[in-house]
């Protein structure tokens, strides 16, 4: 059985479209499961992994490896 584009698995009922944009950064494995690109995490791989040590409470990042501080906090790790 050959599945349609972006369909995977037994019965071709698993859907996965690789993407690298605001809505997700992932590839699809042979079973149609999302595998996040380096630097991204979450169910949709759309949450950047911040700089190691970046404060989860006072820092955040839009891009992998970044660490942007909330107002009133500073330092390499916003701590």
């Amino acid at each position: 059985v050959t599945c349609d584009d972006y369909y995977y698995g037994f019965g071709c009922n698993k859907f996965c479209r690789p993407r690298d944009d605001f809505f997700g950064h992932y590839a699809c494995d042979q079973n149609g499961n999302k595998t996040c690109m380096e630097g991204w995490m979450g169910p949709e791989c759309n949450r950047a992994i911040c700089r190691q040590g970046c404060s989860p409470k006072h820092g955040s990042c839009k891009l992998p490896g970044d660490c942007r501080c909330q107002y009133g906090w500073q330092g390499l790790y916003c701590d």
């Epitope: 479209r17 605001f22 979450g42 169910p43 949450r47 950047a48 955040s60 990042c61 839009k62 970044d66």
Partner: antibody
């Protein structure tokens, strides 16, 4: 279960701004974008934009770029949509909405917030 | 931007009828299409995603088909609760646009 609860109806003057809130519960707030869709009276649905609450990244419909600002407060799991320079054509119900699991489109919706723009 | 053209804009039918609503995209959306049902004063409800997959708790009388640019929503046997407005929406690339809607009324 996933719930999105929006703020109440607003009556605004032309030229002013409105800020609508959407409090999320039942899932990890930073795992999914929050999208905003509006619907003018008797009209269809219009996607306005989305925010990734984890890092604050945004994607906007060019039609609204410059007038709409999406923000999110991780500490309260609340997303906000602010629309400025309001005109009568902005009178609409504004919905926050979230994708489902495994790349579904909009499976979860807030109850909607009616914004009326009138002098 | 990809535009979605939905037809018809309104439709009168009777309980038990088979009804078809079509949606055409201005470009290939690769099955990245959803269908929603909306009743007055309520938020839209997801019926079908990825062109043909039924959302949770949606009755099997609803079905979706199509590929490329042309897609169809079929209700095999209309029930009284199905009278509502239906929208298609693509989610291939931003902006995620909707069709203009099809109002399904009782004949």
């Amino acid at each position: 279960q996933v719930q999105l609860v929006q703020s109440g109806a607003e009556l605004k003057k032309p030229g002013s701004s409105v800020k609508v809130s959407c409090k999320a519960s039942g899932y990890t707030f930073t795992d999914y974008e929050m999208h905003w869709v509006r619907q003018a009276p008797g009209q269809g649905l219009e996607w306005m934009g989305a925010i990734q609450p984890g890092g604050g990244g945004t994607a906007y419909n060019q039609k609204f770029k410059g007038r709409v600002t999406l923000t999110a407060d991780k500490s309260t799991s609340t997303a906000y949509m602010e629309l400025s320079s309001l005109r009568s054509e902005d009178t609409a119900v504004y919905y926050c909405t979230r994708r489902g699991y495994d790349d579904y489109p909009f499976a979860y919706w807030g109850q909607g917030t009616l914004v009326t723009v009138s002098s | 931007d990809i535009q979605m053209t939905q037809s018809p804009s309104s439709l009168s039918a009777s309980v038990g009828d088979r009804v078809t609503i079509t949606c055409r995209a201005s470009g290939n959306i690769h099955n990245y299409l959803a269908w929603y049902q909306q009743k007055p004063g309520k938020a839209p409800k997801l019926l079908i995603y990825n062109a043909k997959t039924l959302a949770d708790a949606v009755p099997s009388r609803f079905s979706g088909s199509g590929s490329g640019t042309d897609y169809t929503l079929t209700i095999s046997s209309l029930q009284p609760e199905d009278f509502a407005t239906y929208y298609c929406q693509h989610f291939w690339s931003a902006p995620w646009t909707f069709g203009q809607g099809t109002k399904l009324e009782i004949k």
